[in-house]
């Protein structure tokens, strides 16, 4: 049987269960190759509070659809009486970056995750030429994920004092130039995840290998190297190599730019200080409030819900959007779709789509940006869930009691982007990371 | 690629204040990065300012800190360069550009560039 997800296949991935304090190994085509979970386990689970290890899920007894797989295994499992075995249960969703399998639920019979991926998309519009795993879990079993960082267009520029260069890199994947507007990047070469660009022309130095890794606790390190044979001439005949070290900052700032720290026979290191790197409990919440010292900041949009069935309305030209955040309040338009955010056509009012559902919610706040994002809407042709993403910025002097009002900004590829200034979004810094 | 045409460039006299528009062809608008440039005779052209499609973020260059604002209405898919106590030294041809780079002020990492407009400051 083929393996459903090649993308996926050359990767040992991680999920965690964090209230059990359970790491589990994924390996969706072949085996995690743990001697404790025995040759064929391709769901692994480390107990760490027993020290123990299980196999969940075995990679011969798999069955997979397309948006499926399920690992079964030989091992017994008493539930109410009935004698069923062991397994794991994959659900894949499309997503736009190979993504994390994220762990949902156990029972004592089926584990349960979720994993949003390119690799589940009915088309290939978000797949890329070459992409990585790019999240780490560290020895606490905290998550560290720069999937955000990873620019499905274009390129970020590496602060260099080399006036004749420009370096761009992209994180965890290759840089993909379609929707350039005709800027030198243009002529970086397919493939390429660090692209040096010397007058007109441009060079593969270095395209992804290894998935992200943790060095010590809040350092990260991804590591470029260019695959194809035959030296650059500026090289002095060594092979590029492009090394980013992400870099969890102290306490909360601005983002920074990514620095080119030292760079000899094209070997370049970079260091990007990003709270990114930090761990993702530092940066987000599944409620509309940050606090606490977990996040050295107070953050609480709670007041900007809207009660007694009323919405906010921004229009997006061919299209009215009606939100309600951070409540369960059933969006009138939005026929009882639990949407938190609802794309009604102006020219014809019965076509309406959830844009994202007030369940699947996430606040976050890092490198001094203010996001509040709603997924699992309904689906677009790709496969795509809809989903919303609303930029917050602190404005003292918001109208509507201080509240303000979202204004769209626009649609790529079924994410709806909003902006939102408002008073709520004034953030409060504690100093104590 | 997306098209761009300047506008709102003329003559003023110093201390004064001008608004320039872009306005931007194509519905990727709000993929890219906007930057406004200018260039005076004979001179390298020189950045002003950018603001970051996904977010209202923006960076000046020190010249025109707090006296030029860069905006967007992407409902409108125009970006808008409000500059205020207008300086002799001001006076430029000032085009607008889009960018699939971050953090960037170069104007080699931006394409799409429009005729531009001419900024006269003079008494």
């Known amino acids: 049987q083929a393996a459903p997800f090649p993308e996926l296949c050359s990767y040992t991935w991680e999920a965690v269960d964090t209230k059990n304090n359970v790491l589990y190994k994924i390996n969706i085509c072949g085996s995690v190759d743990i001697v404790q979970c025995g040759p064929s386990s391709a769901v692994c689970m480390h107990d760490l509070k027993t020290r123990t290890y299980h196999s969940v899920g075995d990679s011969v007894l798999r069955s997979a659809t397309r948006s499926l797989l399920e690992f079964n295994t030989t091992v017994s499992c008493d539930q109410q009486g009935t004698n069923h075995r062991v397994q794991s249960s994959i659900a894949f969703l499309c997503g736009k970056t190979l993504g994390t399998p994220e762990f949902v639920t156990a029972t004592e019979c089926v584990h349960y995750f979720e994993w949003r991926t390119t690799a589940a998309c009915k088309k290939d519009i978000f797949k890329a030429n070459k992409e990585v795993p790019c999240y780490v879990f560290d020895e606490e079993l905290r998550k560290h994920d720069l999937n955000p960082l990873i620019k499905l267009s274009g390129a970020y520029l590496v602060d260099d004092s080399d006036p004749d260069t420009s370096l761009f890199i992209n994180v965890c994947r290759d840089i993909d130039t379609l929707r350039d507007p005709g800027s030198q990047l243009r002529a970086c070469p397919p493939g390429t995840a660090a692209c040096l660009v010397r007058g007109h022309q441009a060079f593969d130095v270095g395209q992804p290998r290894d998935g992200l890794k943790v060095v010590r606790k809040d350092r990260l390190v991804l590591s470029y190297v260019r695959e194809e044979a035959g030296k650059l001439d500026f090289c002095d005949g060594h092979s590029p190599a492009v090394t980013i070290t992400f870099v969890c900052p102290s306490e909360r700032r601005e983002g920074t730019i990514p620095k080119l720290t030292a760079k000899s026979n094209c070997r370049y290191e970079i260091e990007w200080i990003t709270e990114y790197a930090c761990h993702r409990d530092y940066l987000e919440s599944k409620t509309c409030s940050l606090s606490g010292e977990q996040q050295d900041v107070s953050i609480d949009l709670t007041p900007l819900a809207q009660s007694g069935g009323s919405s906010y309305i921004s229009d997006g030209k061919e299209y009215l959007f009606y939100l309600n955040v951070c409540g369960e309040t059933e969006i009138q338009f939005c026929n009882k779709k639990q949407a938190a955010v609802c794309q009604v056509k102006k020219s014809d009012t019965s076509q309406v789509k959830a844009a994202g559902r007030y369940h699947n919610q996430t606040l976050r706040y890092s490198d001094g940006d203010l996001t509040l994002i709603y997924f699992g809407g309904d689906e677009c042709s790709s496969g795509f869930q809809r989903m919303s993403v609303i930029n917050f910025e602190c404005n003292k002097t918001a109208g509507n009691d201080g509240k303000g009002t979202p204004v769209f900004t626009g649609e790529v590829d079924c994410t709806y982007e909003f902006t939102w200034d408002t008073e709520y979004a004034c953030v409060h810094h504690h100093h104590h990371h | 690629d997306v098209q761009l045409v300047e506008s709102g460039g003329g003559l003023v006299q110093p201390g004064g204040s001008l608004r320039l528009s872009c306005a931007a062809s194509g519905r990727t608008f709000n993929t890219y990065n906007w930057g406004w440039f200018r260039q005076a005779p004979g001179k390298e052209r020189e950045f002003v300012a950018a603001i970051r499609w996904s977010s209202s973020k923006t960076s000046y260059a020190d010249s025109v800190k707090g006296r030029f604002t860069i905006s967007r209405d992407n409902a409108k898919n125009t970006i808008y360069l409000q500059m205020n106590s207008l300086r002799p030294e001001d006076t430029a041809v000032y085009y607008c550009?889009?960018?699939?780079?971050?953090?960037?002020?170069?104007?080699?990492?931006?394409?799409?560039w429009g005729q531009g407009t001419l900024v006269t400051v003079s008494s």
């Open positions: 550009a889009a960018s699939i780079v971050d953090f960037t002020t170069n104007p080699s990492h931006f394409g799409s």
